[in-house]
Amino acid sequence: QQQTLPKPFIWAEPHFMVPKEKQVTICCQGNYGAVEYQLHFEGSLFAVDRPKPPERINKVKFYIPDMNSRMAGQYSCIYRVGELWSEPSNLLDLVVTEMYDTPTLSVHPGPEVISGEKVTFYCRLDTATSMFLLLKEGRSSHVQRGYGKVQAEFPLGPVTTAHRGTYRCFGSYNNHAWSFPSEPVKLLVTGDIENTSLAPEDPTFPADTWGTYLLTTETGLQKDHALWDHTAQNLLR
């Protein structure tokens, strides 16, 4: 006899990176017939939703109108059908950005390089932080961590045309509180004809997540479709 229901999916709309004082929606998708969903934050109950009518709804949305550092952290959700509870969802890392200062991003030897050259990004922030994050724009939006007192270096090694793109960095005050984003740095990698094919995209990201984050920062726009699958949170772990 089944003792628990399958775990729900959890994600943030429009993005898991939320500028301070902007809004975010946390979505939890379980099963039709679920009479109650619970959202947990850092191990404590955060919010409850009882969909009506439960048999016609398999997803609930929890609205956070005013993001701040107290709400940044790890979220999970569960749901109940009758008296039977589900397994908890995967963890959603909700990050507050635009905290305190803006780092400076630079690239060595320069923004225009030849395929095979070694490239290093430097992210500098003079305020008290020791962790830095480098993000490449686009659908993959991979996060790299770096450490240093006021500056971190991100060696990309010998680059290929797959490294082309626009990069930004953040200073991180803890895992879930990040600075303003740096100004973008566009890396241009030239190579032979056979190497200039399009870089493969990570299939787990269904949209240009960075563009969505920028929309959030500029307008606080809410979008009603899932831009980040829960697997995106693995980037932070």
Epitope: F41, S44, L45, A47, D49, F62, P65
Partner: nanobody, 126 residues
């Protein structure tokens, strides 16, 4: 901007009842989820009860069956009816709001609330 003003606190004997009120200013009350929290001397603020825009409610285990939260959108007011009061219910009671929110959302964690009242003191003693 939402302003919340609590009233109805006072001194009561164990087993007695009180009704707290929280009046909200502004036209956003109908789009707000509301909650009551309390803080006893030397203790952390704790959740008491909450109500969604659609009148769904949730209670702390310690008050379930004794306290009732309700709202009157016409009067922009949320209430906390407290009965069978005990000495351990002595605290400053705070009203809080999440504005705006979805219809069925009930918020339990204090971090979720973006507006707070100044509090009203409830003392339960013989």
């Amino acid at each position: 901007e939402v302003q919340l003003v609590e009233s109805g606190g006072g001194e009561v004997q164990p087993g007695g009842s009180l009704r707290l009120s929280c009046a909200a200013s502004g036209r956003t009350f109908a789009s707000a989820a509301m909650g009551w929290f309390r803080q006893a001397p030397g203790k952390e603020r704790e959740f008491v009860a909450a109500i969604s825009r659609s009148d769904d409610t949730y209670y702390a285990e310690s008050v379930k069956g004794r306290f009732t939260i309700s709202r009157d959108n016409a009067k922009n007011t949320v209430y906390l009816q407290m009965s069978s009061l005990r000495a351990e219910d002595t605290a400053v009671y705070y009203c809080a709001a999440v504005v705006p929110t979805y219809g069925n959302n009930i918020y339990v964690h204090s971090a979720a609330y973006n507006y707070w009242g100044q509090g009203t003191l409830v003392t339960v003693k013989p």
